[in-house]
């Protein structure tokens, strides 16, 4: 009976999310393997988040709007492990917008989700950021490593969206 009611609840939750995401990929987790964590297909998952790499070339503002329509934001990178996971799926000859910007050019960098910008957990390439005219951040591959660079916001780039996992 308990299992039946949990299944019914799950199905109704799945139906609720189906109007936003036609397909979800779920895995069982938790100490009793009773919780399901899901990401929209074909998003990838890492820890408690889902990631989507958009190959559509758009400005920073349009990239953020594009993520927003999918219930996500441009990616906020919190740890080196998270960055290493993300970069596994990136192409080394491309650049991707992050959810990091400095809209007033005061070198007050801010994350789209209001996560505090911590200078100790940043992965700027050497010498970056280097221009107050360049107010948006990308991640790209340079000098044999992935790192961040400041660029003009209106120049179209690929982008990475991030959302919290859906738990059912």
């Amino acid at each position: 009976n308990f299992m039946y009611s949990k299944t019914v609840k799950r199905l109704s939750k799945l139906q609720e999310y189906q109007q936003y995401y036609p397909s979800l990929t779920c895995v069982m987790e938790g100490k009793d393997m009773e919780d399901w964590s899901c990401c929209p297909t074909p998003w990838t998952s890492f820890q408690s988040s889902c990631y989507f790499i958009s190959t559509v070339m758009q400005s920073w503002t349009k990239s953020q709007n594009n993520c927003s329509v999918m219930g996500a934001d441009l990616v906020v990178i919190n740890t080196k492990e998270e960055q290493d996971f993300i970069t596994q799926n990136l192409k080394i000859n491309s650049a991707y917008f992050l959810g990091l910007s400095d809209p007033k050019g005061w070198r007050h960098w801010q994350w789209v989700d209001q996560t505090p910008y911590n200078k100790n957990v940043t992965f700027w390439h050497s010498g970056e950021p280097n221009s107050p005219d360049e107010r948006c951040a990308i991640i790209n591959f340079r000098s044999e490593e992935w790192g961040w660079n400041d660029v003009h916001c209106h120049v179209p780039q690929k982008s990475i969206c991030k959302m919290k996992k859906i738990y059912i």
Partner: antibody, heavy 121, light 111 residues
Framework: EVQLLESGGGLVQPGGSLRLSCAAS????????MSWVRQAPGKGLEWVST????????YYPDSVKGRFTISRDNSKNTLYLQMNSLRAEDTAVYYC??????????????WGQGTTVTVSS | DIVLTQSPDSLAVSLGERATINCKAS??????????VNWYQQKPGQPPKLLIY???NLESGIPDRFSGSGSGTDFTLTISSLQAEDVAVYYC?????????FGGGTKVEIK
């Protein structure tokens, strides 16, 4: 007072090359992103290229990509536009302009008087 | 590319009267409360001159008879009381996304 003085325009045959210069004064050139914009005779304005202050990022529309190269020499306060494989449709007055950011966008706030490029056989 | 369509192509207005120029973008050029549309004035034989940035902000040194409004895809430049020195071609431009694009221009003349 901001001054931008373009030079290097002239008559060139289709397929030929030309190098435009823009001498800047009255502001700290090395800290400014710079752009080129052109205007065909009797027509509207078309953005041609942009270069960031350090010269390491350059941007072009598809119409000139692969043919035009923007560069700068901050020690000489000069902006350049190298134009190769010129076509009749590149005939225009070429303006250099200073770029000023506005949040996530920008404006072109100071413009030179322009230099005329004519591509004709 | 974002296409900007200006209307009318030309406009004849009496001195002291209001002139209104429209600019329509093929997609929204707004983000987070700002609109990325600028207006320029070009007099014969001269380079363009910045009048309005961010849809409604008057550039320093520009007379306050010029004003800009609008958001999303629809923008307007208004000259509240046309002066003889305002005879020119006016262009809108978007800087939301490369390639930057300009409207086709509106020629303002005195009636």
């Amino acid at each position: 007072e901001v001054q931008l003085l373009e030079s290097g325009g002239g008559l060139v045959q289709p397929g030929g090359s030309l190098r435009l210069s823009c001498a800047a004064s009255g502001f700290t050139f090395s800290t400014y992103t710079m752009s080129w914009v052109r205007q065909a005779p009797g027509k509207g304005l078309e953005w041609v290229s942009t270069i960031n202050s350090g010269g390491d990022n350059t941007y072009y529309p598809d119409s000139v990509k692969g043919r035009f190269t923007i560069s700068r020499d901050n020690s000489k306060n000069t902006l350049y536009l190298q134009m190769n494989s010129l076509r009749a449709e590149d005939t225009a007055v070429y303006y250099c302009a200073t770029y000023r950011p506005y949040y996530y966008g920008s404006v072109l706030d100071y413009w030179g008087q322009g230099t005329t490029v004519t591509v004709s056989s | 590319d974002i296409v900007l369509t200006q209307s009318p192509d030309s406009l004849a207005v009496s001195l002291g009267e209001r002139a209104t120029i429209n600019c329509k973008a093929s997609q929204s050029v707004d983000y987070d409360g700002n609109s990325y549309v600028n207006w320029y004035q070009q007099k014969p034989g001269q380079p363009p001159k910045l009048l309005i940035y961010g849809a409604s902000n008057l550039e320093s040194g520009i007379p306050d008879r010029f004003s800009g409004s609008g958001s999303g895809t629809d923008f307007t430049l208004t000259i509240s009381s046309l002066q003889a020195e305002d005879v020119a071609v006016y262009y809108c431009q978007q800087s939301d996304e490369d390639p930057w694009t300009f409207g086709g221009g509106t020629k303002v003349e005195i009636k």
